[in-house]
Interface confidence: medium
């Protein structure tokens, strides 16, 4: 499977809400011995590879923001914690998963990475990520709502397998 990012750039005004989205394409293993883990984190455009560094989003680490399987939160405390920070991660059964950030500030600008790990117990781990940029703007040049820029076909598939 691979992860695509429908939009590579989100330009949003301060105070607005933004939902960043990733999509899993292709077959994902199913069964008792398979765990699908999804999460989000901030990163930087590394020289070697995008999304290698993992930084917190609003002080929440990628561990705090993770989802298991088809969107079941691993722990309610994690979910509550995210909501207290104006964040919510969600997942559907069509391969889409997202993070919603409420009341954006300039500090939210950065490179956001979604991570999917397929754990085939007793066998291997397959890791894939996608990246997108969020620019939060203020002042007269800021858009009234979020403006999204579609990924080019090349950029939309950020594949890293482990």
């Amino acid at each position: 499977f691979k992860v695509t990012t429908p939009y590579s750039l989100y330009v949003c005004p301060e105070g607005q809400n933004a939902t960043l989205t990733c999509r899993i394409l292709g077959p994902v293993s199913k069964g008792h011995d398979v765990t699908i883990y999804k999460t989000w984190y901030l990163s930087s455009r590394g020289e070697v590879q995008m999304c290698s560094e993992r930084r917190p989003i609003r002080n929440l680490t990628f561990q705090d923001l993770h989802l298991h399987h088809g969107g079941h939160q691993a722990a309610n405390t994690s979910h509550d914690l995210a909501q207290r920070h104006g964040l919510e991660s969600a997942s559907d059964h069509h391969g889409n998963f997202s993070i919603t950030m409420r009341n954006l500030t300039l500090l939210d600008s950065g490179l956001y990475c979604c991570l999917v790990v397929e754990i085939r117990h007793h066998h291997s781990e397959h890791r894939v990520h996608g990246a997108m940029e969020l620019q939060v703007q203020t002042g007269k040049d800021a858009p009234s709502n979020c403006v999204v820029y579609p990924s080019s076909s090349q950029d939309s598939e950020n594949i890293t397998a482990a």
Epitope: T39, S52, E125, A162
Partner: antibody
Framework: EVQLQQSGPELVKPGASMKISCKAS????????MNWVKQSHVKNLEWIGL????????SYNQKFKGKATLTVDKSSSTAYMELLSLTSEDSAVYYC???????????WGQGTSVTVSS | QIVLTQSPAIMSASPGEKVTMTCSAS?????MYWYQQKPGSSPRLLIY???NLASGVPLRFSGSGSGTSYSLTISRMEAEDAATYYC?????????FGSGTKLEIK
Amino acid sequence: EVQLQQSGPELVKPGASMKISCKASGFSFTGYTMNWVKQSHVKNLEWIGLISPYNGGTSYNQKFKGKATLTVDKSSSTAYMELLSLTSEDSAVYYCARRAYGYAMDYWGQGTSVTVSS
Amino acid sequence: QIVLTQSPAIMSASPGEKVTMTCSASSSVSYMYWYQQKPGSSPRLLIYDTSNLASGVPLRFSGSGSGTSYSLTISRMEAEDAATYYCQQWSSYPFTFGSGTKLEIK
């Protein structure tokens, strides 16, 4: 503060079994896998296996299947490893360590020393 | 299983000296992880995903590599860096560690 507190040292007789505990605090227990690692003078570090408190799923190093049994008690945020039919080769320090999926073992217990001797 | 071979097994360095140790994998792995262990203590995570420093790790440590060849470098050796260093892979089961490089201070 993240902590993994393991049970104390053990001196056991050959053929006996024993259980080591690892009490987790300071983080969401179900958001990580709990891994167990053996350290002996002969083999350095060896990964024994992991358990996911989220769903109880386990993965073992084939070498330790039948030797180690991993369980968790979610209510007390405690992971356990039972070691069966002990021999002198099982004398070692055993560590528990938490791991987030797609990451590394970022916090370790202090280790439990097990000595098998008659 | 993937065998990780570390070299050298033992090395010594003077304060301020640059130190490099290597980890060779029997099959290709996607990422390498490095741990530091001092006598009487538990292992401590140093490097994740080949080249990223774990929280609280001094900037003099760095990691690099790909495929079957990886390395850990200390730009300027300090007395507190004397320890045993282990590489580890999570790419395929069973997860394995290298045999360790013991770094001593001259």
